[in-house]
């Protein structure tokens, strides 16, 4: 575009150099050339000469009119045809932009990943604006009334050191550009309620060589949170359907979960946890693949007849991915054997 151009005249845009996409736009060119009474004034857009909708207003001024201008950016300049000059003479140029006012930011979420030292807030920005849009995150203490403001694009990390004076905050996001300003809904945040436990990791799995073989999955976390509620989901690699188990965990020692699985099959396991009674889940852990051993004795295997852990508080449900193309969208099977619940908030689903 044109950042610094020596104009021999003026160029201006109505309604302005930044305008709403789809508007009708008039661009004016006024020459102030010495020793030139121009025969013609020409307009160029992105270096290409324009042919239509040009009006000569008077000796020095011309206008070009665009109906429903919808390009996000254009570089306009105008020239004069001076008698006795072989080349056209540059008069002036302008960068113009079209776009949209911002949508109100939605789905504002703030979490503290354990040990991170930051509160991370994310939101949906809505439809593209095509023009420079700034997001200001407001964090207001409900105890001291003091407000902090952070510039961001689609997320912000706020040091918990700057959140020492209070536990309760009001958080909202303001979207601002040349065409408008919108605020998100306000989010009430209690710092103690938004901590996500340190990542849970499946470290290994083994299948015993018993008459009825069982698979033991070992998993751990470095969390210091005492009361943690977890889900483990698993399926064969050839299956679309996940089984999900729930249990309370105490990470002062490595967790062991027992499964009775089909022999000679490749299984995928993933785990995620949350602080008991809180709403924010960890993302699913990295997929852990385990091959069960071959069947030793004769046994009629009925899928889903016995995949449970020897803990009375456990529930097992089945969820299925909609398709291999949409592995992150999960839905309940229409009929499940067990009391179930959807595996929501899946960030690392695999088909």
């Amino acid at each position: 575009g044109i950042t610094s151009i020596n104009c021999s005249g003026d160029m201006w845009v109505e309604p302005g150099e930044i305008f709403q996409m789809g508007m009708n736009v008039s661009i004016y060119c006024q020459e102030a050339l010495k020793h030139c009474r121009p025969r013609n004034l020409y307009f160029y857009k992105n270096g290409f000469k324009e042919e239509f909708d040009i009006t000569r207003i008077n000796r020095t001024t011309a206008r070009i009119w665009y109906k429903g201008f919808s390009e996000p950016h254009a570089y306009m300049h105008c020239t004069a045809e001076c008698p006795g000059h072989f080349q056209e003479t540059l008069i002036c140029g302008k960068d113009i932009s079209s776009g949209h006012p911002p949508d109100a930011p939605s789905n504002l979420t703030c979490v503290i990943y354990e040990y991170s030292g930051n509160m991370t807030c994310t939101w949906n920005t809505g439809k593209p604006t095509y023009i420079d849009t700034k997001y200001i995150v407001h964090v207001k203490s409900l105890e001291t009334e003091e407000e902090q403001q952070y510039l961001a694009s689609s997320y912000v990390k706020i040091s918990t050191d700057s959140l020492q004076g209070s536990r309760k905050y009001l958080v909202w996001v303001q979207a601002v550009n040349s065409l408008g300003m919108e605020n998100s809904q306000q989010l009430h945040v209690h710092l103690d309620d938004i901590v996500i436990p340190s990542a849970s990791i499946i470290s290994r799995a083994e299948t015993t060589n018993d008459t009825v073989p069982k698979t033991i999955v070992y998993w751990k976390s470095k969390t210091m949170i005492e009361k943690v509620f977890c889900e483990m989901r698993y399926k064969t690699t050839t299956n679309q359907t996940w089984s999900v188990k729930e249990f309370d965990a105490n990470f002062t020692y490595v967790q062991q979960s027992e499964f009775y699985l089909e022999p000679d099959s490749k299984y995928v396991f993933q785990v995620r946890c949350q602080e008991t009674g809180k709403r924010n889940w960890q993302p699913w852990s990295s997929p852990f693949v385990h091959q069960t051993s071959q069947e030793t004795g004769k046994r009629n295997w009925q899928p889903w007849s016995s995949p449970f852990v020897h803990q009375t508080s456990q529930t097992v449900s089945q969820v299925t991915a909609k398709s291999s193309h949409e592995p992150q969208k999960m839905e309940m099977l229409s009929a499940t054997i067990f009391r179930g619940h959807p595996a929501s908030g899946n960030h690392q689903d695999i088909g």
Epitope: I136, E146, Q148, Y150, L151, S159, S162, Q174, V176, M181
Partner: nanobody
């Protein structure tokens, strides 16, 4: 209560430099977003530069590359280093709490005059 006091203005030739200071008190300066705004003769208030609560800075196109905003939290002081000054930078400069958008400049100081002239 919030108090802001600007200083460092003066008369300078085009191409020269000035450093403005803003002494702050009555609030938690270290975690507050701050802005420099200016008012040219016969014109409205325009924002110049802002610094957010985490130290991210933003500048108006007209001063980008010439002005630098900074904070010294130990001294509760906001600065604006102005280089390559132009005649069009002539204005009264104010420091204010908050960023340049929204409920803007809810509190600002008395201002300091900057005149760029040959």
């Amino acid at each position: 209560q919030v108090q802001l006091q600007e200083s460092g203005g003066g008369l300078v030739q085009p191409g020269g430099s000035l450093r403005l200071s803003c002494a702050a008190s009555g609030f938690t300066f270290s975690t507050s977003a701050m802005t420099w705004v200016r008012q040219a003769p016969g014109k409205g208030l325009d924002w110049v530069s802002g610094i957010d609560s985490g130290g991210t800075t933003v500048y108006a196109d007209s001063v980008k590359g010439r002005f630098t905003i900074s904070k010294d939290n130990a001294k509760n002081t906001l600065y604006l280093q102005m280089n390559s000054l132009k005649t069009e930078d002539t204005a009264v400069y104010y420091c204010a709490t908050g960023l340049p958008w929204g409920n803007i400049w809810r509190t600002r100081g008395q201002g300091t005059q900057v005149t760029v002239s040959s």
